[in-house]
């Protein structure tokens, strides 16, 4: 099995250093009263998904179909990445999660050049769609850190709901209460190989 | 519904040139690794050579290695193989080869070849 | 460099099941395509990822791999299934291809 969990706090602390560098541009664009969620995003970054028992995510796009596994890999095989690009919310919150002054990290993930994870809370899936900037709220998932190095990803749009796995595929998942955030099948693993 | 057609073949003597193109349609072209894989004479396919969509980076056989050149113009959807130094070896039929699925990020040529044209040859002859 | 190889051909009566292997080195640690190409046509996709067939391709043909083999299988072989079939894996960035088998229908 692949153990990818220990690359990952290695890009989150440094996120502290990031933060601070960023409060300024926050207070600014606060005074002026611009949209935070209107600037660029803190960082980005490219890790390859993994969940919490090490099976990879990967991703398989034409221009009219897609398809998201959830597998093991092949030994030779090179893991997908995706592109995580963390916000900060406009909304302070009360949840435990990364962030600055109460307010939460908010990540948009794209497996490849124009295409992002979108949250369908209707029919309870993981998408990807093609869109562009500024991407909808279906988009952004506060981000997590949850126990073991691994994250989670709740929907921006649906509170309480995160991305999970189900079936050997990536669903949306309600969790009822605090305790089933550490639930396995909606813990992640990013890994920078 | 996804089209590739190539063109550029023909006779050339040993030691010339040819240019090769592969005009795509049908698909987003800038999001797919592109290759060529040709056919000698009744044998069988061998990869010449591809490119990546995010980087653009190159591949090479041993074989075509500092002879060929692969490169693609997105805006004008097309892939390109330039061919010097032609040997008698490098008779065959050229394909032009979509990638199944879009590039990752990660890159690199890692996806089995979806889509292909209809091929050009060339012959390279005194 | 790395080297797959084919039987050169294979013969199958009509209905039966035909079976064609690509032999590599760790071959299972890689995922194994095959491509159908009839005779003065481009080559056609009809397994990728060992076992999955593209939306077309009819559900007679199957593959499997592991160890150093990869095995397309062809169930209720059809005249029309004559054809050269080709198996292909990524390695290192560059695409290596089998030497091709000759499925004949007799």
């Known amino acids: 099995m692949h153990h990818h969990h220990h690359h990952h706090h290695h890009h989150a602390a440094g996120l502290n250093d990031i933060f601070e560098a960023q409060k300024i541009e926050w207070h600014e664009a606060a005074i002026e009263g611009r949209s935070i969620t209107g600037i660029s995003p803190i960082t980005e970054y490219l890790a390859s998904l993994s969940t919490y028992n090490d099976q990879s995510i990967t991703f398989a796009l034409e221009d009219e179909s897609y398809e998201i596994y959830v597998e093991d890999l092949k030994k030779d095989e090179k893991k997908d990445k995706v592109l995580l690009s963390y916000y900060e919310s406009q909304h302070p919150s009360n949840e435990s999660g990364d962030g600055v002054d109460g307010k939460m990290l908010m990540v948009t993930l794209s497996p490849t050049k124009d295409f992002w994870l979108h949250a369908n809370n209707k029919e309870h899936s993981v998408e990807l769609h093609k869109c562009e900037k500024p991407l909808p709220d279906q988009a952004f998932f506060v981000l997590h850190n949850m126990h073991s190095n691994c994250v989670s990803f709740e929907c921006k749009t649906d509170p309480g709901v995160f991305i999970g796995v189900k079936d050997n595929h990536l669903a949306l998942i309600k969790v009822d209460s605090s305790e089933n955030l550490c639930t396995e099948n909606i813990l992640f693993k990013l890994s920078e190989t | 519904e996804v089209q590739l057609l190539e063109s550029g073949g023909g006779l050339v003597q040993p030691g010339g040139s040819l240019r090769l193109s592969c005009a795509a349609s049908?698909?987003?072209?800038?999001?797919?690794?592109m290759s060529w894989v040709r056919q000698a004479p009744g044998k069988g396919l061998e990869w010449v050579s591809g490119?990546?969509?995010?980087?653009?980076?190159?591949y090479y056989a041993d074989s075509v290695k500092g002879r060929f050149t692969i490169s693609r113009d997105n805006s004008k959807n097309t892939l390109y193989l330039q061919m010097n130094s032609l040997r008698a070896e490098d008779t065959a039929v050229y394909y032009c080869?979509?990638?199944?699925?879009?590039?990752?990020?990660?890159?690199?040529?890692?996806?089995?070849?979806?889509?292909w044209g209809q091929g050009t040859m060339v012959t390279v002859s005194s | 460099s790395y080297v797959l190889t084919q039987p050169p051909s294979v013969s199958v009566s009509p209905g039966q099941t035909a079976s064609i292997t690509c032999s590599g080195e760790?071959?299972?640690?890689?995922?194994a395509a095959w491509y159908q190409q009839k005779p003065g046509q481009s080559p056609v996709l009809v397994i990728y990822?060992?076992?999955k067939r593209p939306s077309g391709i009819p559900e007679r043909f199957s593959g499997s791999n592991s160890g150093n083999t990869a095995t397309l299988t062809i169930s209720g072989t059809q005249a029309m299934d004559e054809a050269d079939y080709y198996c292909?894996?990524?390695?290192?960035?560059?695409?290596?291809f089998g030497g091709g088998t000759k499925v004949t229908v007799l």
């Open positions: 049908g698909f987003t072209f800038s999001s797919y690794a």
């Open positions: 490119i990546s969509a995010i980087d653009q980076s190159t």
């Open positions: 990822r060992d076992t």
């Open positions: 760790r071959m299972g640690d890689k995922y």
């Open positions: 080869a979509r990638d199944l699925w879009m590039e990752n990020w990660v890159g690199g040529l890692r996806y089995p070849f979806g889509y």
């Open positions: 292909e894996v990524k390695k290192s960035d560059t695409g290596v």
